[in-house]
Interface confidence: low
Amino acid sequence: LQDPCSNCPAGTFCDNNRNQICSPCPPNSFSSAGGQRTCDICRQCKGVFRTRKECSSTSNAECDCTPGFHCLGAGCSMCEQDCKQGQELTKEGCKDCSFGTFNDEEHGVCRPWTDCSLDGKSVLVNGTKERDVVCGPSPADLSPGASSVTPPAPAREPGHSPQ
């Protein structure tokens, strides 16, 4: 036998106590699939969260973060304070990257400068709190008589740690 509730479309719920009538979801609730016996409560974007997409009868609200904060977690479940480039967020707040590390984003953690010597290269441009070092040709490549200059390694994508 077919479940009569299966006829209830998204945006409604199946009323068990009213002979399986399909009733519209109440304000501030939604059902994203058919055949539901209750509607889900809409997410409320309050405080540091702001509404990116309003709740509808068939889909939940989506939140992002107010300026000065960024999303963390699936579906922006948390907002974390932004820091400046060259800083990272600690329990005590935003702290400058320690010597030998950098952060070129307004979130995330300080990462170690690339060790150019691992690739047999030398430091072409020194690193800062905000920028990684730039590796250049190896010292051998710069010696007189060298026939060619090895191009620097491709830049890493932001947010990726050195391998």
């Epitope: 719920f13 009323d15 009733s23 059902s31 016996r37 209750t38 889900d40 409560i41 409320q44």
Partner: antibody
Framework: QSVEESGGRLVTPGTPLTLTCTVS????????MSWVRQAPGKGLEWIGI?????ITYYASWAKGRFTISKTSTMVDLKITSPTTEDTATYFC???????????????WGLGTLVTVSS | AIELTQTPSSVSAAVGGTVTINCQAS??????LAWYQQKPGQPPKLLIY???YLASGVPSRFKGSGSGTEYTLTISGVQSADAATYYC????????????FGGGTEVVVK
């Protein structure tokens, strides 16, 4: 249709504990579920809900102290760091709704007793 | 957060008498209220939903009424089996509800 809680026992303060609610005769994809607790000789206290789509809602006092999750036939309640104030019978209950939009508990388990003591 | 205040906390009634329990919400809950009966060692049992609708299998001597912020559960022709604690519960789509239940009313039948 039935709801049954398990996992309640004596634990020392700070020892995480997970309670399990096993349902039969209905689908967790159709019904939201809730956890409610009752300290000895006290009233009913709502902890939180897990919706059909897995969204969780907690009473403000319960946020960070409890975590609700589910599989296809079970709903778990994790007490993250129990204190003696968490000593209670924990009930799992099914939520239902109708066209006046009331959410009410139409099926309850018998409850499982958690005792937190050093 | 919506708060529910139940009065009285305890009431005594003779068999055949009438008991009235009140539930006041801190703000309007638009008839989104349920009543439960709980006996010692048992889980709560749904009696009334949507303020006035009788749940399946509940005797007609139980009656719910009210609207806005004021709600009442009336038990007419009280029987010894009605000795229990009764709780009101606010609607669940109000996600800010800190405690969905009133404090409870103990009914003692003489």
């Amino acid at each position: 249709q039935s709801v049954e809680e398990s996992g309640g026992r004596l634990v020392t303060p700070g020892t995480p504990l997970t309670l399990t609610c096993t349902v039969s005769g209905f689908s967790l994809s159709s019904y939201a579920m809730s956890w409610v607790r009752q300290a000895p000789g006290k009233g009913l206290e709502w902890i939180g809900i897990i919706s059909t789509s897995g969204i969780t809602y907690y009473a403000s006092w319960a946020k960070g102290r409890f975590t609700i999750s589910k599989t296809s036939t079970m709903v778990d309640l994790k007490i993250t760091s129990p204190t003696t104030e968490d000593t209670a019978t924990y009930f799992c209950a099914r939520l239902n709704g109708f066209d006046d939009y009331v959410r009410y508990f139409d099926f309850w388990g018998l409850g499982t007793l958690v005792t937190v003591s050093s | 957060a919506i708060e529910l205040t139940q009065t009285p906390s305890s009431v005594s009634a003779a068999v055949g008498g009438t008991v009235t329990i009140n539930c006041q919400a801190s703000e309007s809950i638009a008839s989104n209220l349920a009543w439960y009966q709980q006996k010692p060692g048992q889980p709560p049992k749904l009696l009334i939903y949507a303020a006035s609708y009788l749940a399946s299998g509940v005797p007609s001597r139980f009656k719910g009424s009210g609207s806005g912020t004021e709600y009442t559960l009336t038990i007419s022709g009280v029987q010894s089996a009605d000795a229990a604690t009764y709780y009101c519960q606010s609607a669940f789509y109000v996600s800010s509800s800190d405690n969905a239940f009133g404090g409870g009313t103990e009914v003692v039948v003489k």
